[in-house]
Amino acid sequence: WPPPGTGDIIVQAPTQVPGFLGDSVTLPCYLQVPGMEETHVSQLTWSRHGESGSMAVFHQTQGPNYSEPKRLEFVAARLGTELRDASLRMFGLRVEDEGNYTCLFVTFPQGSRSVDIWLRVLAKPQNTAEVQKVQLTGKPVPVARCVSTGGRPPAHITWHSDLGGMPNTSQAPGFLSGTVTVTSLWILVPSSQVDGKSVTCKVEHESFEKPQLLTVNLTVYYPPEVSISGYDNNWYLSQNEATLTCDARSNPEPTGYNWSTTMGPLPPFAVAQGAQLLIRPVDKPINTTFICNVTNALGARQAELTVQVKEGPPSEPSGMSSN
């Protein structure tokens, strides 16, 4: 707002006023008169830059006159009162209402005093974020999608991620004329390490008090990644039974585990129990390579582990007895 005048009358108004599409907005405009100054306002006038004629006039004796009576209204000006408040209300804001307006007071004997106000027509966007479920493509693909719908001006979208990648942002006209829908994709090369991790879409718009943060949990479909655990290279004869575990990471979850050996089916001392393989005590040394084959909807993968059961008791309980 301009500083108060010291001796002269002055028109006070904000340089910019925001309003929302379809809503009403008040363009404030006041005449400030120093204490000693005598003035008489005969007319208030609102006009739009680049247009001939006035859109709203309030005359001291004739009252208001509007170019669009259903959409315009003087907020405070009334016949028979001092015309010091020219504030104008606009209803049903349209995109084409955005622009520069002049509020003018005709005062006597000082003459005309005016101020320009920029009306910004805003539309608050609706924001959504969703995962783009992908498989291991080996090349960059969209893994998350963030959409800011129907904003005016267009929303600004950024991404926050520890996974690497890059954004791809585009704009398209919104449903309402003058609005814009912004779509941003987060693109990276999918890997199993990405699955289950999150990225955050940040949407900024001047209609928001603070940026909106939308978190997306990523989904990467991949076949099983398999390993076998439970063997520590120190298994001996005459020890307790032990367990091998088939560790599988996959998306979707594994649908089946199949144990075998390089020689074919499992030997009698090995009993499959789903993801686990129970190794019972044996009375002679063995050297067997076990295979765990894991299946999910995308395929099957396997891991191998060679187990040796050696002669001679350990110096202290370990090996098979440790499991």
Partner: antibody, heavy 121, light 109 residues
Framework: QVQLVQSGAEVKKPGASVKVSCKAS????????ISWVRQAPGQGLEWIAW????????NYNQKFTGRVTMTTDTSTSTAYMELRSLRSDDTAVYYC??????????????WGQGTTVTVSS | QAVVTQEPSLTVSPGGTVTLTCRSS?????????ANWVQQKPGQAFRGLIG???NRAPGVPARFSGSLLGDKAALTLSGAQPEDEAEYYC?????????FGGGTKLTVL
């Protein structure tokens, strides 16, 4: 064309009142500001007051407050100035003047021919 | 009340330029005084020339111009004509009242 025609000369006794009229033509009377100005013999011009014809809003020179009343009759497009408690130093030619507007500033546009008021016992 | 002072008389040759000034007893004349200038020819009614310091009234020849000159209001007549011979009054606004100057008698000789 725009014209202001004032009433004729008046001779008044001290303590009396005088009411001078100013009939306007050629423009929208209700949208106008009219000032009253006087000039005493051998003296300069002195502003008395202005009135906004449409509403009757007025602004008086403090020197005359309480003694002068300005009114308008919009039906006849006439402005009036009444001065009470007349003294001999109120003897002067009284003028009405319509203020015009250029779009940026006001000016003393059109003047009446003047009304001579003589205050004498 | 303030006193507004003008040159009592000035003379200009036909076609010449002359500047009439208007001084305020309260200090510098500013745009907030909305200086007005009116003309009165002998036997004729007053006529408004300038309002709001420098706004020429409709129909007033362009040879008349209003301005602020230093701490005074000024009326400049460029290319004086014999018909410009008249009395010129300056009027200043002081927050809530007008004050007239004593007038300048301009002779075109």
């Amino acid at each position: 064309q725009v014209q202001l025609v004032q009433s004729g000369a008046e001779v008044k006794k001290p303590g009396a009142s005088v009411k001078v009229s100013c009939k306007a033509s050629g423009y929208t009377f209700t949208s106008s500001y009219i000032s009253w100005v006087r000039q005493a013999p051998g003296q300069g011009l002195e502003w008395i007051a202005w009135i906004y014809a449409g509403t009757g809003d007025t602004n008086y020179n403090q020197k005359f407050t309480g003694r002068v009343t300005m009114t308008t009759d919009t039906s006849t497009s006439t402005a009036y100035m009444e001065l009470r408690s007349l003294r001999s130093d109120d003897t002067a030619v009284y003028y009405c003047a319509r203020h015009g507007y250029t779009g940026r500033g006001w000016y003393f546009a059109v003047w009446g021919q003047g009304t001579t008021v003589t205050v004498s016992s | 009340q303030a006193v507004v002072t003008q040159e009592p008389s000035l003379t200009v040759s036909p076609g010449g330029t002359v500047t009439l000034t208007c001084r305020s007893s309260t200090g510098a004349v500013t745009t907030s005084n909305y200086a007005n200038w009116v003309q009165q020819k002998p036997g004729q009614a007053f006529r408004g020339l300038i309002g709001g310091t420098n706004n020429r009234a409709p129909g007033v020849p362009a040879r008349f111009s209003g301005s602020l000159l230093g701490d005074k209001a000024a009326l400049t007549l460029s290319g004086a004509q014999p018909e410009d011979e008249a009395e010129y009054y300056c009027i200043l606004w002081y927050s809530n009242h007008f004050v007239f100057g004593g007038g300048t008698k301009l002779t075109v000789l």
